[in-house]
């Protein structure tokens, strides 16, 4: 037989299908010009020493073969002995290792069999009513096709699906969308209405994320507040990466999950902007305020579930950084200014009450005064911190108050509001004899002691009613008792106690009279 012709003899190997898993498959035959034809196939398994034979049976029942050698593609003309106008059945037999392996048969009319391309170029993926919709431009001069898809997940094999007939300049397919796993899709086409025409090759992989992006499993830590009043938010655990099917590993456009960080600054609610969204890779610096932090995952189908954390406020207090002067017109606070043209947010709330009851005030941008201080004043009528109770005050600063991540904490401290001098006066002062020349003075703790760092000391004042001499005894703010010694028997004394803050002298308690009895010896 001539090599260019189909040989109508028995092939040079025994006629027996080994039924092995390897072998030829995906046979495609089509016209490539007015008088030339091509068949191609794939061979699965070791290729060394394999000879391929293209078999053809005519409608008359006569059969022939082409010897392709080790090639998996073969061209022939309409003069090769194969009927091109009538239906023929073709298959490939591969002779390897003393056994024959056969491909599935294709039955077609070669003249009308056109080589169809798979979807080429950009395949658009969208979600439609819980399903996946793929859309692509029909390859040139190939309108009218039957389309199939196959899909797999990282843990499942290929499954075949049908897209149905297409006959437009754009073709589309509805496919199943997985909720929680990524999928790889491939598409193939063949001529519509041409009985037995060959399928095109499979398209390049189309990688599709799950409908729900994976919930971010991340952990944060917050560093200590630095000298600049800011603390760094750091990511302790990176988000888990999506597991991808085999053909999507490496570069898999379409399955990307983007993680965004949404910051919500809970403190200082009177500022202009409370939330900011950032890329997860760019970890911000935060003030000492309280924040809610959400990590939002999203893919091409939109956002998924988010994970939210609460970052509590830094409660480290500066006992002396804030100076408060109370005058007839109102109250003024002074603190070390941060820089030129800073906006300050002063926030206060009664101690022991829910954070939602915080009040705040935003200053206009201000420069330091000649002493390098920033100030905030309010009138008594405003009612700010007017009640006689303990307030927690935090001052934040920013040169760009509209940018959430540029706030810093200037200071946090406690302040006793209202008329602290009078409200702090100790009550229930009592005097007990201690020895022949001393007494013990006790009192109930001042209300100022409920306000950390506010009560500087108690002062106990004793007055000799006769000589009018006075003594003053400083007492630690944690103590509510002092022993007065060196007293003289028979002298009439009065004792009073006051509670002082760093900048306010307290009001004396009501005088208590006492004396030490003169001891008469027998």
């Amino acid at each position: 037989c001539r090599t260019s012709e189909c040989c109508f003899q028995d092939p040079p190997y025994p006629d027996a299908d080994s039924g092995s898993a390897s072998g030829p498959r995906d046979l495609r035959c089509y016209r490539i010009s007015s008088d030339r034809y091509e068949c191609s196939w794939q061979y699965e398994g070791p290729t060394a020493g394999v000879s391929h034979f293209l078999r053809c049976c005519l409608s008359s029942g006569r059969c022939c073969y082409f010897a392709a050698g080790s090639a998996t593609r073969l061209q022939f003309s309409d003069q090769a002995g194969v009927s091109v106008l009538y239906t023929v059945t073709l298959w490939v037999e591969s002779w390897a290792r003393n056994q024959t392996e056969k491909s599935p048969e294709v039955t077609l009319q070669l003249y009308n069999s056109v080589k169809y391309e798979p979807p080429l170029g950009d395949i658009k993926v969208s979600k439609l009513a819980g399903q996946l919709r793929m859309e692509w431009e029909t390859p040139d001069n190939q309108v009218g096709a039957e389309v199939q898809f196959r899909h797999r997940t990282p843990s499942s094999p290929w499954k075949l699906g049908d897209c149905g007939p297409q006959d437009d300049d754009t073709e589309s397919c509805l496919c199943p969308l997985e909720m929680n796993v990524a999928q790889e899709f491939q598409l193939r086409r063949r001529q519509l209405g041409s009985q037995g025409s060959s399928w095109s090759k499979w398209s390049s992989p189309v990688c599709v994320p799950p409908e729900n992006p994976p919930q971010p499993q991340v952990r944060f830590s917050v560093e200590q507040l630095g000298q600049d009043g800011r603390r760094r938010l750091t990511l302790k655990e990176q988000p888990t990466q999506l597991e991808l099917p085999e053909g999507c590993q490496g570069l898999a456009p379409g399955t990307e999950v983007t993680y965004r960080l949404q910051l919500h600054m809970l403190s200082c609610p009177c500022k202009a902007k409370a939330t900011r969204t950032l890329h997860l890779g760019k970890m911000p610096y935060l003030s000492g305020a309280a924040y809610n932090v959400a990590v939002i995952s999203s893919n091409q189908f939109g956002p998924g579930l988010n994970q939210t954390w609460h970052i509590p406020a830094d409660t480290h207090t500066e006992p002396v950084a804030l100076n408060i002067s109370v005058g007839t017109n109102g109250t003024t606070m002074y603190w070390p200014a941060r820089a030129q043209s800073m906006t300050y947010c002063i926030e206060w709330q009664p101690v022991g009450q829910d954070g939602g009851l915080a009040t705040c005030s935003l200053t206009a941008p201000q420069d330091p005064d000649p002493a390098g201080m920033a100030t905030y004043s309010w009138s008594r009528e405003s009612g700010a911190m007017g009640q006689e109770k303990c307030y927690y005050i935090t001052i934040f600063a920013s040169a760009h108050p509209e940018k959430l991540t540029l706030w810093s904490t200037v200071l946090s401290t406690y302040h006793f509001g209202g008329n602290a001098s009078a409200a702090g006066t100790p009550h229930h002062v009592s005097v007990k004899n201690h020895s022949l020349d001393s007494v013990s003075v006790d009192w109930a703790p001042s209300l100022l002691s409920t306000c950390p760092g506010v009560l500087k000391e108690y002062v106990v004042r004793c007055r000799d009613e006769d000589s009018k001499q006075v003594s003053e005894h400083p007492v630690q703010p944690t103590e509510t008792q002092v022993t007065l010694s060196g007293l003289r028997a028979g002298v009439a004394y009065t004792v009073q106690v006051r509670a002082d803050t760093a900048w306010l002298r307290g009001v004396w308690s009501q005088p208590q009279r006492f004396s030490i009895e003169v001891q008469v010896s027998d």
């Epitope: 020349d437 004793c462 000799d464 006769d466 000589s467 001499q469 003594s471 003053e472 005894h473 400083p474 007065l484 060196g486 007293l487 003289r488 002298v491």
Partner: nanobody, 123 residues
Framework: EVQLVESGGGSVQTGGSLTLSCTAS????????VGWFRQAPGKEREFVSA????????YYSNSAEGRFTIAVDNAKNTVYLQMNSLNPEDTAVYYC????????????????WGQGTQVTVSS
Amino acid sequence: EVQLVESGGGSVQTGGSLTLSCTASGRTGSTDGVGWFRQAPGKEREFVSAIKWIGGSKYYSNSAEGRFTIAVDNAKNTVYLQMNSLNPEDTAVYYCAAGAIMFPSRPRDFDFWGQGTQVTVSS
């Protein structure tokens, strides 16, 4: 034995201020603290102010309270008396003394005395 040296006296106009210093040496730990007394010509020595070495308790006469402030620097064993709003009645020799601090204070409670420093207030 405790030695006491006063300084800071001088002349001042009515309404003026002076700060007196008293530096102690020797066995200061045997005393409660330091007191200031004054003696005007032809008058008895009178108590002005006192302070304890430990605890910082302060003592003032009726006339000194509100105008004078006593303070101690333990590291230097020095006691200071800051006198404001001085008037001619404050003219006297001011003595520093160390000893037991009783209340009310009297000169006889104090065992160790300095030489004194003159304060003159003119109108």
